[in-house]
Interface confidence: low
């Protein structure tokens, strides 16, 4: 009989006995010669390694590639397959030899003590008891005990085969503790060795791989995969692995049972696959299959093997993130990399640390984003092995719904002199800038704050008949100026102005600003009076420690009893859009002030002087005058703002720079402070003087050095000073290149 596929050039080895089956008697000599076309080897039963003393394999004397196998005095146990094969190939010729030994018809096992057969209680499963025969045509039955039962071949599911053993449905002998085969020869009974029957379970609950997913390694690293099978009791498990590079030299497989708690209804088995130094060919799907004979469960995971440690940003990494003030912002660091990189976040170059407002990790999370969070966030990925870094900048733009600056000044009804031209402003801060600012108005009398129409939190506007400013029928003649843009307190703001040509009617005006993320509004009470008039001397906002006078001028023939008051601490909460009670009707909230009276030919002038104004002097000042005829009181309110003294600060930095000879340098130094600071420039600590090449503009804010020369190199300092001190910034300007020699004729 031949085994294996014939190759192109080799014939099968040829045996001297040209039979598939040979039957010989015990105690005779077995001799078979094998001839071929290259180096040959023999394999024989029981001892497959060739070290048995009784077996002799010799080279033939009459030719190359020829070997003779000789066994003198054969015994029943020599029964089996004898194979002659070419080394390192599958090409082989086989003969099955029966050594008839009627005193020992069963081939004894190596242990010669007892065997074990494993069975499952399954109707469809058969079990083979391996009692092989040295005689092919024996009458064999199977004895099971206890209680004793005998099973004879029935030509169907119970059978005996000399090369295989006794086959029987496993459930038939599952009750038994042991079984053996029995042969009758000439009324003589011969028994095989005993086989202990072990009933095993088969149910596998699950197979789990660890790590279960996302396994990444780089070439040369060790891969360790654990496969755990959980089964019912009495289960034996066979593990089988499938993986990309199955011919791996550095592969190691270790299988073991895991201890489970006593009383547990479950067993655990573990198979560990280890590859000491992975290569790219080890990348792929790894499948662990656990089999109990009747049941197989498997699990798979993908192992990615990188050429070397690396890190790169994923294609989904954002470059621009937009958010609205107050929102939670999440910026994930999307990367491709092995091993996972260390992630560090920076804002405008400064490392970010996690706290209660910000979490800087795999995802940068800002709990409640504010405007100051706007900026460039750099995420730096560092490969922990190669230390290679990759950086990516994400610009965070925080949108701000429109905020109207004047709205924060809680002031009562300002009074405006009849017939005067007045300008109302709404200074809007919004990001992005508002796409429109609209003005609306309504008559004050339509919105009278009568007791019957008490303003409440639930009804902040007792009137809502707002009209467009284009329709000024019955009101003041209005003109809306084109929006202006101004840098106020370091912020770009939009200023919308409404010009009332002649203040004839008391009214309410509302500005409404809208941008992509929201809206804001401000209601201005425009109360027109023919009464006194307040002016400020000097006519500007005072700064702390400066002096200011408030002048109240009234026509002497119409008014008398001029008195200055200051509105006390806010008497009632002012709700959004609420109109305060007219001050003349509520003198309880006013504090009387000392003032000096002057008169000219037509007017009385009551002057209230504030020397060394302080922040406490801010507030609403009321001038009260009484009509000589009707005795009706007229009030005028003026809000006074005192600017805080602020030491000079310089916004932004001067950058060190390198410039070539002949080029120009332009730098800016923006300073703020109150009083406004004076700006001076120094080079190498010497005052910088303007000349043809050095130009200072905009109150020394901008410095230009034209056609730079080598001697312009040095340390430049911008210094901003006021009575409150100085601030300075420095930068070093390097001038490159050789100085051209100038020939003056």
């Amino acid at each position: 009989a031949s085994v294996g596929l014939p190759s192109v050039s080799l014939d099968l080895p040829r045996l001297s006995i040209q039979k598939d089956i040979l039957t010989i008697k015990a105690n005779t000599t077995l001799q078979i010669t094998c001839r071929g076309q290259r180096d040959l080897d023999w394999l024989w039963p029981n001892n497959q390694s060739g070290s048995e003393q009784r077996v002799e394999v010799t080279e033939c004397s009459d030719g190359l590639f020829c070997k003779t196998l000789t066994i003198p005095k054969v015994i029943g146990n020599d029964t089996g397959a004898y194979k002659c094969f070419y080394r390192e190939t599958d090409l082989a010729s086989v003969i099955y030899v029966y050594v008839q030994d009627y005193r020992s018809p069963f081939i004894a096992s190596v242990s010669d003590q007892h065997g074990v057969v494993y069975i499952t209680e399954n109707k469809n499963k058969t079990v083979v008891i391996p009692c092989l025969g040295s005689i092919s045509n024996l009458n064999v039955s199977l004895c099971a005990r206890y209680p004793e039962k005998r099973f004879v071949p029935d030509g169907n599911r119970i059978s005996w085969d000399s090369k295989k053993g006794f086959t029987i449905p496993s459930y038939m002998i599952s009750y038994a503790g042991m079984v053996f085969c029995e042969a009758k020869i000439n009324d003589e009974s011969y028994q095989s060795i005993m086989y202990i029957v072990v009933v095993v379970g088969y149910r596998i609950y699950d197979v789990v791989l660890s790590p279960s997913h996302g396994i990444e390694l780089s070439v040369g690293e060790k891969l360790v995969l654990n496969c755990t099978a959980r089964t019912e009791l009495n289960v034996g498990i066979d593990f089988n692995w499938e993986y990309p590079s199955s011919k791996h030299q550095h592969k190691k497989l270790v299988n073991r049972d895991l201890k489970t708690q006593s009383g547990s209804e479950m067993k655990k088995f573990l198979s560990t696959l280890t590859i000491d130094g992975v290569t790219r060919s080890d990348q792929g799907l790894y499948t662990c299959a656990a089999s109990s004979g009747l049941m197989t469960k498997k699990n798979s995971t993908f192992v990615r093997v990188h050429e070397k440690p690396f890190v790169a940003f994923g294609s989904g990494m954002e470059s621009l993130v937009e958010a609205t003030v107050g929102e939670r912002v999440r910026i994930p660091a999307k990367y491709l990399g092995y091993p996972p990189p260390e992630i560090k976040w920076y804002k405008n170059g400064i490392p970010l640390e996690s706290n209660h407002t910000i979490k800087a990790g795999h995802v940068l999370t800002i709990m409640e984003v504010s405007e100051r969070d706007t900026g460039n966030y750099t995420v730096i990925l560092t490969n922990p092995i190669s230390k290679e870094k990759q950086s990516h900048v994400v610009s965070l733009v925080v949108y701000v719904p429109p905020q109207i600056g004047e709205k924060s000044l809680i002031s009562p009804v300002d009074s405006y002199q009849y017939g005067t031209t007045q300008t109302l402003t709404c200074t809007v801060y919004a990001i992005p800038p508002p796409h429109h600012i609209h003005w609306y108005w309504q008559l004050e009398e339509e919105c009278a704050n009568e007791p019957s129409q008490a303003v409440s939190v639930t009804n902040p506007y007792p009137c809502e008949e707002w009209r467009s400013v284009e329709d000024f029928q019955g009101g003041n003649k209005i003109e809306v100026n084109k929006n202006q843009f101004a840098l106020i307190e370091g912020k770009n703001k939009t200023v919308s102005t409404l010009v009332i040509q002649a203040a004839n009617v008391s009214a309410l005006y509302k500005c409404e600003a809208v941008n992509k993320v929201g809206r804001g509004e401000r209601v201005i009470s425009f109360h027109v009076t023919r009464g006194p008039e307040i002016t400020l001397q000097p006519d500007m906002q005072p700064t702390e420690q400066e002096s200011v006078s408030l002048w109240c001028t009234a026509d002497r023939s119409t008014f008398e009893n001029l008195t200055w008051y200051k509105l006390g601490p806010q008497p009632l909460p002012i709700h959004v859009g609420e109109l305060p009670t007219p001050v003349c009707k509520n003198l309880d909230t006013l504090w009387k002030l000392n003032a000096t009276m002057f008169s000219n030919s037509t007017n009385d002038i009551l002057i209230m002087e504030l020397k060394n104004a302080s922040l406490q002097d801010q507030g609403d000042y009321v001038c009260l005058a009484q009509d000589r005829k009707t005795k009706k009181r007229h009030c005028v309110v003026r809000q006074l703002t005192v600017l805080e003294r602020v030491a000079p600060t310089i916004t932004g930095n001067l950058e060190n720079q390198t410039t070539s000879i002949g080029e120009s340098i332009e730098v800016s130094c923006t300073a703020s402070g109150n009083p406004p600071p004076q700006i001076m420039w120094f080079k190498d600590n010497e005052t910088l003087v303007e000349d043809s090449g050095i130009v200072l503009k905009d109150g020394n804010r901008n410095l230009t050095i034209r056609r730079v020369r080598k001697e312009d190199e040095g340390l430049y300092t911008c210094q901003a000073c006021s009575v409150l001190g100085c601030a300075k910034v420095e930068a070093f300007f390097i001038i490159e290149g050789a100085q051209e020699k100038t020939n003056l004729e």
């Epitope: 990615r304 990188h306 294609s315 470059s319 491709l336 950086s391």
Partner: antibody, heavy 121, light 110 residues
């Protein structure tokens, strides 16, 4: 003007070497990964190699790995392809390409005109 | 074997609509942005679509891109004779860790 200009192509015998250059202008070169793509006569586009902004990471197609080396000089706004052990199958038009986004490996919105490399004996 | 599969050729009459499919796998099309390129005879490729469905400025809205699962599609409406060209899809492949192009599709305007 934003552009890429390749040079250095020509005829070479199998086993020989060539160095291709790509000069970039009109954009912040050091902010972009740079890529070489080739196209054999009558065939489709084949990605050859790319290099990250600082030149620390390079990836190459299996067909050229070990023979071709990509490098860059950010000061000169240039990217190079050193081609050694050239084979007949390396005959192609070689394009230099820039990805659409900074710090991104692909999606090429800027291409050079290409330079022809012919490998034959 | 090509990583991204495209039909070798497609054809349609002027004014008609044509679609060019590009088939890939989980590691490329599913996980990454797809871009499309047009290569007119004798010229360098030109970016038509990026990020699956976005058009660079200057690309008419007759060209559109879409992606679903492991497939991406380039659509061209109102075909013109000037659209006769080779069209390539491209994307990053996470497993191969390299950029991959489709084999290319020749568009003929009948």
């Amino acid at each position: 003007e934003v552009q890429l200009l390749e040079s250095g192509g020509g005829w070479v015998k199998p086993g020989g070497s060539l160095r291709l250059s790509c000069a970039a202008s009109g954009f912040p070169f050091s902010d972009y990964y740079m890529t070489w793509v080739r196209q054999a006569p009558g065939k489709g586009l084949e990605w050859v190699s790319y290099i990250t902004t600082g030149g620390r990471i390079i990836y190459s197609a299996d067909s050229v790995r070990g023979r071709f080396t990509i490098s860059r000089d950010n000061a000169k706004n240039s990217v190079y392809l050193q081609m050694n052990s050239l084979r007949a199958e390396d005959t192609a038009v070689y394009y230099c390409a820039r990805p659409l986004r900074e710090l991104s490996p692909g999606g090429f919105d800027l291409w050079g005109r290409g330079t022809m490399v012919t490998v034959s004996s | 074997l090509p990583v991204l599969t495209q039909p070798p050729s497609v054809s349609a009459a002027p004014g008609q609509k044509v679609t060019i499919p590009c088939s890939g796998t989980y590691s490329n099309i599913v996980n990454n942005y797809v871009s499309w390129y047009q290569q007119l005879p004798g010229t360098a490729p030109k970016l038509l679509i990026y990020d699956n469905n976005k058009r660079p400025s200057g690309i008419p809205d007759r060209f559109s891109g879409s992606k679903s699962g492991t497939s991406a599609t380039l659509g061209i409406t109102g075909l013109q004779t000037g659209d006769e060209a080779d069209y390539y899809c491209g994307t990053w492949d996470n497993s191969l860790r390299r950029w991959v192009f489709g084999e290319g599709t020749k568009l003929t305007v009948l």
